[in-house]
Interface confidence: low
């Protein structure tokens, strides 16, 4: 019965990039400008994103696909379709609310986005720091100290003070 | 143990200044990635953040009470305080300094609370 | 400012129910939102934070979920000492409280 009903609905004729217009005895009526139906058998058409500001066009909106944005140049995306811009910082900060600040000692980011992580405490693997770790690079890790030749030293870098991310104690 | 006590509450005359001083124990407020702020709750109303100072030395207002507001501290004493001048009855509220609990820095909640101190603004 | 709306205002709920609170912000913050409770004469206590973290110390009861503007804070099966007020608070750009959501008894 449900399956009758729904091909005797007018509606479920029109494509997407149309909607049932209940005003005009529900014939298949193109959306209109900046508005689109991605699915056929709609009611209405919604209104297309419109990329402002911090935000650029990537892909036009069309009557069939709503329009795609991304940010522009110093910003990246952040969220589900691109639904935030983030200022960018440099190799070896963090985003704070007060813009981009250094990573802490014992902490780096490799990255223009994210959170400063701590260096790799080669130690808990039993090898030795071969590379010291810097703001935007971590530790490259070596040979364990007993591998080592004689004479050879390494180098353990402290644990930073509070790692990011932390739950609260 | 992390604990913040405020003190410094009391009547206030309208036009006046007060001056709250939170005092932290079982953390430095000088260590990296450590930031405290204040809050306050008027009477049978919600919460409104007001100010927040980090480990070095940066500080934020909320921006309705920006002109009014100062943050500080005293390392030595590891102590918060907050400053607000021009006082009016709707300051009336309790004033609560709080720690926040992420080094994330976007993205931040508040762990460890004082009891808060009661300040009534009236003539 | 990035506005937070909390909803319901106030609610009534017998011990044993299922309770959500829901919050929304006025523009997208991704997942940085917690949920406090506080009961009179106290200070706030944290109970959620970046959207769906239990805080030290708080009982599998209470949930966290959402993300972008719109954020749900669930008690599944509310108990006595439950019954106090709950605030959502963004930490994206500054920081922003509810109004808050007091849960009462039936």
């Known amino acids: 019965f449900e399956r009758t009903r729904s091909l005797q609905d007018p509606c479920s004729n029109c494509p997407a990039g149309t909607f049932c217009d209940n005003n005009r005895n529900q014939i298949c009526s193109p959306c209109p400008p900046n508005s689109f139906s991605s699915a056929g058998g709609q009611r209405t058409c919604d209104i297309c994103r419109q990329c402002k500001g911090v935000f650029r066009t990537r892909k036009e909106c069309s009557s069939t696909s709503n329009a795609e944005c991304d940010c522009t140049p110093g910003f990246h995306c952040l969220g589900a379709g691109c639904s935030m811009c983030e200022q960018d910082c440099k190799q070896g900060q963090e985003l704070t609310k007060k813009g981009c600040k250094d990573c802490c000692f014992g902490t780096f980011n490799d990255q223009k986005r994210g959170i400063c992580r701590p260096w790799t405490n080669c130690s808990l693997d039993g090898k030795s720091v071969l590379v010291n770790g810097t703001k935007e690079r971590d530790v490259v890790c070596g040979p364990s100290p007993a591998d080592l030749s004689p004479g050879a030293s390494s180098v353990t870098p402290p644990a930073p003070a509070r790692e990011p991310g932390h739950s609260p104690q | 143990e992390v604990q913040l006590v405020e003190s410094g509450g009391g009547l206030v005359q309208p036009g006046g200044s007060l001056r709250l001083s939170c005092a932290a124990s079982g953390f430095s407020l000088s260590t990296g990635g450590v930031a405290v702020g204040w809050i306050r709750q008027a009477p049978g109303k919600g919460l409104e953040w007001l100010a927040l100072i980090d480990w070095d030395g940066d500080k934020s207002y909320s921006t309705s009470l920006k002109s009014r507001l100062t943050i500080s501290r005293d390392n030595s004493k590891n102590t918060l305080y907050l400053q607000l001048n021009s006082l009016r009855a709707e300051d009336t509220a309790v004033y609560y300094c709080a720690r926040e609990g992420s080094t994330a820095v976007v993205g931040d909640w508040f762990d460890y609370w004082g009891q808060g101190t009661l300040v009534t603004v009236s003539s | 400012d990035i506005q937070l709306t909390q909803s319901p205002s106030s609610l009534s709920a017998s011990v044993g129910d299922r309770v959500t609170i829901t919050c929304r912000a006025s523009q997208g913050i991704s997942r940085y939102l917690a949920w406090y409770q506080q009961k009179p004469g106290k200070a706030p206590k944290l109970l959620i934070y970046?959207?769906?973290n239990r805080a030290t110390g708080i009982p599998s009861r209470f949930s966290g979920s959402g993300s972008g503007t719109d954020f749900t804070l669930t008690i599944s099966s509310l108990q006595p000492e439950d019954f106090a007020t709950y605030y959502c608070q963004q930490g994206y750009s500054l920081w922003t409280f509810g109004q808050g959501t007091k849960v009462e008894i039936k």
């Open positions: 970046d959207a769906s």
